[in-house]
């Protein structure tokens, strides 16, 4: 009865050149998940379909890996990967649930600089 909620990894940061796992979890509903779409702004990154399995968009094939679970792994991160990511759960009979993750990709030197000069 559309009682579900999506828990996400929230706002996350990662280093340029590294990788990150985007994770969402749908809870508090008995609805059946038929498909999860992963999108960045209006671009479809990947689909995990209950019947057909995973499909990665051709333009992201080299840098996106399915999983773990219904999550998505982004590899070889660039500063251009900074932005909002959405997990869109298509369920029956509830319909659509959407979760949001904000990813900030930091220059390696900035990340190192930040670590080196932390205020105690």
């Amino acid at each position: 009865m559309m009682t579900g909620t999506i828990e996400t990894t929230g706002n996350i940061s990662a280093e340029k050149g590294g990788s990150i796992i985007l994770q969402c979890h749908l809870s508090s509903t008995t609805a059946q998940v038929t498909q999860v779409n992963w999108e960045q702004q209006d671009q479809l990154l990947a689909i995990c379909n209950a019947d057909l399995g995973w499909h990665i968009s051709p333009s992201f094939k080299d840098r996106v890996a399915p999983g773990p679970g219904l999550g998505l792994t982004l590899q070889s991160l660039t500063v251009n990967d900074t932005g909002e990511y959405f997990c869109i759960y298509h369920t029956y009979p509830d319909g659509t649930y959407t979760g949001r993750i904000f990813l900030e990709v930091l220059e390696s030197s900035v990340a190192e600089h930040g670590a080196r000069f932390q205020i105690p």
């Epitope: 559309m2 038929t34 209950a50 298509h90 009979p93 319909g95």
Partner: antibody, heavy 123, light 107 residues
Framework: QLQLQESGPGLVKPSETLSLTCTVS??????????WGWIRQPPGKGLEWIGS???????FYNPSFKSRVTISVDTSKNQFSLKLSSVTAADTAVYYC???????????????WGQGTLVTVSS | DIQMTQSPSTLSASVGDRVTITCRAS??????LAWYQQKPGKAPKLLIY???SLESGVPSRFSGSGSGTEFTLTISSLQPDDFATYYC?????????FGGGTKVEIK
């Protein structure tokens, strides 16, 4: 404009299998946003949901029909189908196909319907 | 299954009348209720969803209210085009179930 059109025999003999197809035009059955359902209406009576399907083949059935019903999808033809086995006179009804779509976070609703096809079960 | 009970089953009214149809659910369905209009020989048409949200293109004389187990559909000023049968449907819990219908006829 999305259109749905039911087709199939108008007369089925008792104990046989009722088979209907719904052809979708003006939109893709493969959209991840929609589910596709069958509803029936016996003459002079109310509406009864039979079941629904997702483009990839996931099915959802009314337990009242579960042992007798099969819904399938053919994305290459933009069609989905209903099979109801071991029919009796009580299965005589107008059969509708319909699209189930969301309205934001408001669940799934039957927003587009076919015009319906009358199936009579009689020997 | 959730039983949906509509009343009255038939309603006689005149053009310009304010008409109210009631739908009761056998258990709480929150606001997951839709109203459909059906004319003879035609498919049902979605009017209202989530108990009170008007479907795009539906005249504003139609309104819905209620939550939990009791819901109403109101036509503020009945028009000639509104003589039809109206069905409520719960879509919160499987299986989806419909009310028995209310026929609005000319007095």
């Amino acid at each position: 404009q999305l259109q749905l059109q039911e087709s199939g025999p108008g007369l089925v003999k008792p104990s046989e299998t009722l088979s209907l197809t719904c052809t979708v035009s003006g939109g893709s059955i493969s959209s991840s946003l929609y589910y596709w359902g069958w509803i029936r209406q016996p003459p002079g009576k109310g509406l009864e949901w039979i079941g629904s399907i997702y483009y990839s083949g996931s099915t959802f059935y009314n337990p009242s029909f579960k042992s007798r019903v099969t819904i399938s999808v053919d994305t290459s033809k933009n069609q989905f189908s209903l099979k109801l086995s071991s029919v009796t006179a009580a299965d005589t009804a107008v059969y509708y196909c319909a699209r189930e779509a969301g309205r934001g976070t408001t669940g799934l609703l039957f927003d587009y319907w076919g015009q319906g096809t009358l199936v009579t079960v009689s020997s | 299954d959730i039983q949906m009970t509509q009343s009255p089953s038939t309603l006689s009214a005149s053009v310009g009348d304010r008409v109210t149809i009631t739908c009761r659910a056998s258990q709480s369905i929150s606001s997951w209720l839709a109203w459909y209009q059906q004319k003879p020989g035609k498919a049902p048409k979605l009017l209202i969803y989530k108990a009170s949200s008007l479907e795009s293109g539906v005249p504003s004389r139609f309104s819905g209210s209620g939550s939990g187990t009791e819901f109403t559909l109101t036509i503020s000023s009945l028009q000639p085009d509104d003589f039809a049968t109206y069905y409520c449907q719960q879509y919160g819990i499987l299986p989806r179930t419909f009310g028995g219908g209310t026929k609005v006829e000319i007095k």
